[in-house]
């Protein structure tokens, strides 16, 4: 059956032979209606990439550099299955390219000029492409030929496989630049030995190199890693201090109509029958015909790449930056230490319009990028299409798990001038009901619920976390009879109450009328029994404070708070009647952009912050007629975080624990991708 067939692309006679054997052996173990293998032979991996894009083949396994080529237009391929190494219990699908130095040296990443460098080999990922790609814009001009620019940047190097005649400085630390183990400084162990012997000041290797060469922790403690933010960390902190995370070997397919489920079904069955130590007749991860045919011989199995993970996310911002610099050879005109405009990520068109107005008023210091959901915005910040946005705590958690960092906190209670340096305790997550109802915290089952959005703190994580510990399952859509929780599955009962309009029904952005704090309260006013919001929501939308038709006649006393002990209290008493304290919303960014974002935002709030009194004829950053566009409307200022500069420290142990527990109920495709 052609639609059940996976056309595997082979790049040599030997691969084609193994592919035919793969095809025949899979036929013998799979049912006739199951997936089948067909083999397509091409001259090179690039030809395979083109063939898949043209729908002449379906899959091929590629090294990281080729995954980058496969992702570029017009190919537009995406990773679907990853090879893993090590054990099934602790599968390794990535390695980390690192810069190792001796602990007793005193320079940082931005002080490498004039140092001596040790590389694994010319053109190799960890030893050359990544470090030189990331340093590319610091190299002296002209940057071509690249070897000459590198020779002039370092004071001496060992770059195995380089041309020692044309570029003698690259072979200064290893005469002749031998391209095999005859050169004592060749490859990973050699580059590390070059550093260890004192020949070089820095070695560009894999994170595992240090552990493979130094079994003794005391010896390893003599070395450190250089981080991209110009700090240092110990060698076992490579996950937080590396030049790039590099995928090892990956199966790619078309982004649209790519048969990824079929490819996974095929490879999953293949590893069951012909994986490591499974069969004498045919081995997936070895071959009598040659090395690394179709798959790496060192692979132990396959893992499905989460569907939300596109090539940009899979390869990572640092890796793509390095490879793009090397390939395109272009550098920004401004020096790299100068802050370029900050690209703010706006949710849908309401936020985009406010962002555009901010952009005009900032004289272009702010630029705007749009996405339809918060998770799409986070992904854009991760891959460099955007730089920053302000997020509810639930999304600060997801952003943190995806490698972003909190930069500034929204403050709601501290009057100026102390505001900028004050760390507030947070706001209260509350459950609001109509005074006329007889609801309590203990009889919510079967009622109609209103939520700000799935994954947000007051509207979801806190109430559903508390509910989970009571009901011990994740079927929240069965607990409530119906509700509006934007971001839920469209056919879920938790989308039934949403107002839309139609194509935007239950979407987690302002196009859905019941989205956010104000939206969830409106949902309660018009349709629901209980709304999960922040403690300020009712006062901010009653007594004529919200001029919209649905809100202008609402009275604060017509609403009450549910307390966890089963009682109810006035909305004026949130301190004595709340579900939990929630961390304030915070601005997040990539680590490399955090300082620029902070500096620019502090400057912008001085011009457009809460000191502006007349928002009808001036631009106000923290005002959007109760719509909470870009920032919460009740923000007084954006405040420095001081030492709370990681998502764990910012959110606090208790909240992180609560969200981590809720992860078993997670519907976040982005979180799944970021924890792959």
């Amino acid at each position: 059956v052609p639609e059940k067939s996976v056309r595997w692309c082979a790049v040599s006679e030997h691969e084609a032979t193994k592919c035919q054997s793969f095809r025949d052996h899979m036929k013998s173990v799979l049912p006739s209606n199951g997936p089948s293998v067909a083999c397509v032979k091409k001259a090179s991996h690039l030809d395979c990439i083109r063939a898949i894009a043209a729908n002449e083949a379906d899959a091929v396994t590629l090294d990281a550099g080729l995954v980058y080529d496969a992702y570029l237009a017009p190919n537009n391929l995406k990773p679907v299955v990853a090879e893993f190494y090590g054990s099934k219990e602790d599968p390794q699908t990535f390695y980390y390219a690192v810069a190792v130095v001796k602990k007793d040296s005193d320079f940082q990443m931005n002080q490498l000029r004039g140092r001596k460098s040790c590389h694994t080999g010319l053109g190799r990922s960890a030893g050359w492409n990544i470090p030189i790609g990331l340093l590319y814009c610091d190299l002296p001009e002209p940057r071509k030929p690249l070897e000459k620019a590198v020779a002039n940047f370092f004071s001496g190097s060992c770059v195995p496989c380089a041309d020692g005649t044309d570029f003698p400085q690259l072979c200064q630390l290893c005469p002749g630049c031998g391209c095999s183990t005859l050169n004592q400084y060749f490859s990973y162990s050699g580059a590390f030995k070059c550093l260890k012997d004192g020949a070089g000041d820095v070695a560009f290797v894999k994170h595992s190199t240090i552990f493979e060469n130094l079994a003794n922790k005391a010896d390893r403690d003599q070395y450190e890693l250089l981080c991209l933010d110009n700090t240092r960390k110990s060698v076992d902190e490579y996950k937080d201090c590396h030049l790039a995370r590099v995928p090892s070997h990956t199966v790619v397919a078309r982004s649209v109509g790519g048969k990824e489920d079929l490819i996974w079904e095929l490879l999953n069955q293949a590893q069951e029958h012909f994986g490591k130590d499974k069969s004498k007749e045919f081995q997936l991860f070895s071959s009598p015909h040659g090395k690394d045919l179709l798959f790496k011989d060192s692979a132990h199995g396959f893992l499905k790449v989460p569907p939300r993970m596109d090539a940009k996310m899979y390869l990572g911002y640092e890796y793509i930056t390095a490879i793009r610099n090397l390939r395109e050879g272009t550098c920004p005109e401004a020096p790299t230490d100068e802050c370029k405009p900050v690209k703010w990520c706006a949710l849908s068109h309401h936020e985009r319009l406010k962002c555009d107005e901010w952009s005009v008023n900032s004289a272009g210091k702010i630029e705007c990028e749009s996405a339809e959901t918060t998770e799409d915005c986070i992904a854009k910040i991760m891959n460099g299409e955007a730089d920053a946005m302000s997020l509810d705590g639930g999304f600060v958690y997801i952003a943190g798990m995806c490698g972003l960092v909190p930069v500034l906190a929204e403050n709601y209670n501290t009057p100026n001038p102390n505001c900028e340096n004050t760390a507030e305790e947070g706001y209260f997550a509350v459950a609001v009901v109509k005074s006329s109802s007889d609801l309590t915290w203990d009889n919510l089952k079967g009622k109609k619920s209103c939520h700000t959005a799935v994954g947000r703190t007051a509207g979801w994580n806190i109430p559903m976390g508390l509910l989970y510990s009571k009901i011990n399952h994740c079927r929240f859509d069965e607990f409530f009879s119906e509700g509006c929780a934007p971001g839920s599955e469209k056919n879920s009962s938790l989308c039934k109450l949403c107002m839309g309009p139609s194509p935007n029904l239950c979407e987690p952005n302002n196009k859905e009328g019941y989205y956010g704090y104000t939206g969830a309260f409106r949902c309660l006013v018009e349709k629901g029994d209980v709304a999960f919001v922040k403690h300020q929501t009712v006062p901010q939308n009653t007594g004529g404070k919200n001029p919209d038709a649905w809100a202008k006649n609402l009275k604060e006393e017509d609403y009450e708070l549910l307390c966890l002990d089963g009682s109810r209290k006035s909305v004026q008493e949130p301190a004595n009647c709340h579900l939990a304290r929630a961390p304030n919303h915070a601005v997040v960014a990539r680590k490399d952009k955090a300082d620029c974002v902070q500096t620019l935002l502090l400057d912008q709030q001085r011009m457009f912050g809460s000191s502006v009194t007349d928002c009808s004829s001036n631009f106000c950053l923290f005002e959007s007629k109760t719509k909470d566009l870009l920032f919460r409307d009740d923000t007084v200022c954006l405040a420095k975080l001081h030492d709370r500069n990681t998502y764990e420290k910012y959110l606090g142990e208790e909240y992180v624990k609560a969200v981590t527990n809720l992860r078993k109920c997670s519907t976040s495709p982005l979180l799944e991708a970021c924890t792959f």
Partner: nanobody, 117 residues
């Protein structure tokens, strides 16, 4: 809330010029930010240029150096001078004062600009 009416569009050859006008039904002196947007078929509406009351201007990267936004508060009009026009500038051009945009997508009729040989 003032009504805005766009005019000045038309068919022009590549390399040619046009001047768009946006006339307001009331005073724009107290309006902080005025801007021109455009929307090409099948594309999202995008900011082309903006101007604040104090005269601060911002331009989309694709029009920098070719387009100039200005405002005449006495005439309650905002202008967009478009030079060195390219086929990719073809779109409906809209003017906004941002006053109602936080509530709903309120836009006027716009004015069609077509750049073609």
């Amino acid at each position: 809330q003032v009504q805005l009416v766009e005019s000045g569009g038309g068919l022009v050859q590549p390399g040619g010029s046009l001047r768009l006008s946006c006339a307001a039904s009331g005073s724009i002196a107290s309006i902080n930010t005025m801007a021109w947007y455009r929307q090409a078929p099948g594309k999202q509406r995008e900011l082309v240029a903006g101007i604040t009351r104090s005269g601060t201007t911002t331009y989309a990267g694709s029009v920098k150096g070719r387009f100039t936004i200005s405002r005449d508060n006495a005439k309650n009009t905002v202008y967009l001078q478009m030079n060195s026009l390219k086929p990719e500038d073809t779109a409906v051009y809209y003017c906004t004062d941002y006053s109602s945009s936080y509530y709903q997508d309120y836009w006027g009729q716009g004015t069609q600009v077509t750049v073609s040989s």
